[in-house]
């Protein structure tokens, strides 16, 4: 199976493009919108009927080094009485993001783009019921 | 920059931090090779805080196409299938990194960009403000 490639010879190259060695791409890791802040509603992870916890994964050879992952606290959902209702399901909501991986081969260093699946939070869903004949 | 461990046997010229500009292999490694079969794509309909998905396309971005969530209701769907306004549907937002062609239209020159996307919605108890 082919691994997707970023960039391509398919593109007409404008004159202003920087020269890039074959098989690689130039990546500026000075992030655009670096200081943008998430304006998510306050502590929704605790107020949700499908609450979740956060875990920070840290990897010094990854950029960004910190990636936050959510885990649903319950299998069921929290009802109006604050009790777990197992007739409903808490399920993870996921989103793909890109990271840069730094690889050491002997004394040389190379960089690789990676797609990483991040669990962002949880939502409460009605279960799919499979009827057995 | 990000400090990384240095192989003690290597020359000291190696920078401990990520440099500002790097040359990256064109092949993207996929950490999520086995898409979780339990990961359903119909949660947007089955959720008590259902959402619609909107297509956003930008050829100068990698990925070019991103599907964004918008909550269908202000309230949440109760057991009877009606909207309950005592609860709130709110978007779950995430900052993700994408690549932006820089300069524009260049095939193999990018800059990282942080964008905020709404991934889905969740049902929350509202914050009640009591007026004195």
């Amino acid at each position: 199976r082919k691994i997707p490639k970023v960039g391509h010879t398919f593109f007409q190259k404008p004159e202003s493009c920087p020269p890039v060695p074959g098989g690689s791409m130039k990546l500026d890791i000075g992030i655009i919108n670096e200081n943008q802040r998430v304006s998510m509603s306050r502590n929704i992870e605790s107020r949700s009927t499908s609450p979740w916890n956060y875990t920070v994964t840290w990897d010094p050879n990854r950029y960004p080094s910190e990636v936050v992952q959510a885990q649903c606290r319950n299998l069921g959902c929290i009802n109006a009485q604050g009790k777990e209702d197992i007739s409903m399901n808490s399920v993870p909501i996921q989103q793909e993001t890109l990271v840069v991986r730094r690889k050491h081969q002997g004394c040389s260093v190379s960089f690789q783009l990676e797609k990483v699946l991040v669990t962002v939070g949880c939502t409460c869903v009605t279960p799919v019921i499979h009827h057995v004949q | 920059g990000i400090t990384i461990p240095r192989n003690p046997g290597c020359p000291n010229s190696e920078d401990k931090n990520f440099p500002r500009t790097v040359m990256v292999n064109l092949n993207i490694h996929n950490r999520n090779t086995n898409t979780n079969p339990k990961r359903s794509s119909d949660y947007y309909n089955r959720s008590t805080s259902p959402w619609n998905l909107h297509r956003n396309e930008d050829p100068e971005r990698y990925p070019s196409v991103i599907w964004e969530a918008k909550c269908r209701h202000l309230g949440c769907i109760n057991a009877d299938g009606n909207v309950d306004y005592h609860m709130n549907s709110v978007p779950i937002q995430q900052e993700i990194l994408v690549l932006r062609r820089e300069p524009p239209h260049c095939p193999n020159s990018f800059r990282l960009e942080k964008i905020l996307v709404s991934v889905g919605c969740t049902c929350v108890t509202p914050i009640v403000h009591h007026v004195a």
């Epitope: 199976r1 082919k2 997707p4 970023v6 960039g7 391509h8 398919f10 593109f11 007409q12 | 996929n30 898409t35 794509s41 119909d42 949660y43 947007y44 309909n45 998905l53 909107h54 297509r55 396309e57 050829p59 990698y62 990925p63 070019s64 196409v65 991103i66 599907w67």
Partner: antibody, heavy 121, light 106 residues
């Protein structure tokens, strides 16, 4: 190699519904959207809409709202299009085609072989 | 919706002859794709984002244009180029196709 295998020809009665399928192989199914195209007997091509197997998102040409429902099943790597309340106007060849979400300049790069739908009483 | 008008609707050319067909959009668009279709087969991606040839497309084909006016050119017509060529825009929903230009060999 990349393949989009579409279901066989359909001969259906007016007023009924039909579901066409498009089974994908040879690539990572969730990296691509599936678009559906109608080709009329006059050889006119019309874009029906798109489904994203990853998120479940769909977008329709307003002309086909209420006519076509697009879905995809990740586990079987199959996209479906249901056509409802069929009339003779719906007699056509229907194609599924893939569209790379990561770099859109590829366009619709692989097409299924097409499914012929004939609506006749 | 954006209407794409292709002209001519039908044309014929001798082998070796230069062939140009046009696609006019009712509103300005950023990119144009072209698809080739032969009788009894599915359309094939031919040129995308105005001028980028799909893999396997002979270099005698070229695409150009901007705004509302786009064209596809065959520098030196060959027998295998006889087909119908459709332009397609994806700058605005719904995506639309032109009515096609049928190219025949003399």
């Amino acid at each position: 190699q990349v393949q989009l295998q579409q279901s066989g020809a359909e001969l259906v009665r007016p007023g009924t519904s039909v579901t066409l399928s498009c089974k994908a192989s040879g690539y990572r199914f969730t990296d691509y959207e599936i678009h559906w195209i109608k080709q009329t007997p006059a050889q006119v091509l019309e874009w029906i809409g798109v489904t994203d197997p990853e998120s479940g998102g769909t977008l329709h040409n307003p002309k086909f709202d209420g006519k076509a429902t697009l879905t995809a099943d990740k586990s079987s790597r199959t996209a479906y299009m249901e056509l409802r309340s069929l009339t003779s106007e719906d007699s056509a060849v229907y194609y599924c085609t893939r569209y790379y979400k990561y770099e859109s300049f590829y366009g619709m790069d692989y097409w299924g072989q097409g499914t012929s739908v004939t609506v006749s009483s | 919706q954006i209407v794409l008008t292709q002209s001519p609707a039908i044309m014929s050319a001798f082998p070796g002859e230069k062939v140009t067909m046009t696609c006019s959009a009712s509103s300005s668009i950023s990119y144009m794709c072209w698809y080739q279709q032969k009788p009894g087969t599915s359309p094939k991606r031919w040129i995308c984002d105005t001028s980028k040839l799909a893999s396997g497309v002979p270099v005698r084909f070229s695409g150009s244009g901007s705004g509302t006016s786009y064209s596809l050119t065959i520098n030196s017509m060959e027998t295998e180029d006889a087909a119908t060529y459709y332009c397609q825009q994806r700058s605005s929903y719904p995506w639309t196709f032109g009515g096609g230009t049928k190219v025949e060999i003399k």
